[in-house]
């Protein structure tokens, strides 16, 4: 089993869109397959696909979950917040017939304010 | 280019063991998502998968000769070997060493080949 | 174990003509959930290894003559040369990877009439 996560890096617009592709390879054919995603750590869900469909399509905040065959499961982020920055990290274990698993490198998101000058303020008003 | 290189004695003398080796060139057998195989052809037949050797070390056998085979790699030498024990006649096959990913499922790289005779 | 049973075991085709060799397997090779048909067509000429022709039932390998195809999903499954060419004397197998063991047909001996 091999997973390769995508983009490595993804800067995006707060309110805007933000799409993590996860591709789930193995040589066999798996019955069940359990998938994870998480987010500096903390995980924001944890479905299965089982007969080509996931059990579960919302994923953390704002946050949905799709699998397209033969391999692609993508998280979309829509709208996107400040606090969806951070670390994402793609896990699959083959359940069904044997267990297998693997995860993805790290996907870094950085959210833009929508209001650049939103930046300059909270630093400016850092107190002392 | 890929290459699969097997090597090892043609004639093996029954109830010892068979020890093949394939040396791979063109591309580093600890690249993630590979399975390193052994498939044989007795003489005039069809192709017999033995095992695998999967780039996180684990192995995978062909239950009609599990209690007979290990699959091992050696990364510093870029290559992986058969052992298979208390061979008899039935063993004689031209012994194949291949590479599947887990992208394709197919065996895309084969050696020439190497055959091993069982024979007193 | 799933078992593939190629037929015929030879086969004798005039230059130019259609050959077809049948694969059937004893359980269904096709994944709902990644939509595949676990299948593939190797090519193995005299004193060769053999050599990927056809993989997921119906791609064809890149380079591959495009008179070779794959066609077939669940158990049944073909491979098809549209206009034998004298360069394709040869056995033909199919090879499923649905499941370990991964298993191979007996294999179709092709020769010119």
């Known amino acids: 089993l091999s997973v390769q996560q995508g983009p490595n890096l993804l800067q995006v617009r707060q309110g805007s869109q933000a799409t993590l592709v996860c591709q789930v390879d193995q040589a066999t054919a798996w019955e069940r397959l359990r998938v994870k995603w998480t987010k500096d750590g903390a995980i924001l869900c944890q479905p299965y696909i089982t007969n080509g469909s996931l059990s579960l399509g919302v994923c953390g905040p704002q946050g949905r979950l799709s699998w397209q065959a033969p391999s692609h499961l993508t998280l979309q982020l829509d709208p996107v917040s400040l606090n969806h920055s951070g670390a994402y990290v793609c896990w699959a274990a083959v359940e069904i017939p044997e267990l297998e698993e693997a995860e993805g490198n790290i996907t870094r998101l950085f959210v833009d304010p929508d209001d650049p000058t939103q930046n300059r303020n909270r630093i400016a008003s850092f107190p002392g | 280019q890929v290459q699969l290189q097997e090597s090892g004695p043609g004639l093996v003398k029954p109830s010892q063991t068979l020890s093949l080796t394939c040396t791979v060139s063109?591309?580093?057998?600890?690249?993630?998502?590979?399975?390193w195989s052994w498939i044989r052809q007795h003489p005039g037949k069809g192709l017999e998968w033995i095992g695998y050797?999967?780039?996180?070390?684990?192995?995978y056998y062909n239950p009609s000769l599990k209690s007979r085979v290990t699959i091992s790699v050696d990364t510093s030498k870029n290559q992986f070997s058969l052992k298979l024990s208390s061979v008899t006649a039935a063993d004689t096959a031209v012994y194949y060493c291949?590479?599947?990913?887990?992208?394709?499922?197919?065996?895309?790289?084969w050696g020439q080949g190497t055959l091993v005779t069982v024979s007193s | 174990d799933i078992v593939m049973t190629q037929s015929p075991d030879s086969l004798a085709v005039s230059l130019g003509e259609r050959a077809t060799i049948n694969c059937l397997s004893s359980?269904?090779?096709?994944?709902?959930?990644?939509?595949?048909?676990?299948l593939n067509w190797y090519q193995q000429k005299p004193g060769q290894s053999p050599k990927l022709l056809i993989y997921?039932?119906?791609t064809r390998l890149s380079g591959v003559p495009d008179r070779f195809s794959g066609s077939g999903s669940g158990t049944d499954f073909t491979l098809t040369i549209s206009s034998l060419q004298a360069e394709d004397v040869a056995d033909y197998f199919c090879?499923?990877?649905?499941?370990?063991?991964?298993?191979f047909g007996d294999g179709t001996r092709l020769e010119i009439k």
């Open positions: 359980q269904s090779l096709f994944s709902s959930n990644t939509k595949r048909n676990y």
């Open positions: 997921h039932a119906s």
């Open positions: 050797i999967y780039t996180s070390g684990r192995t």
């Open positions: 291949a590479d599947m990913a887990d992208k394709g499922g197919w065996f895309a790289y």
């Open positions: 063109g591309f580093s057998i600890t690249t993630g998502g590979y399975y």
């Open positions: 090879q499923q990877h649905y499941e370990t063991p991964l298993t």
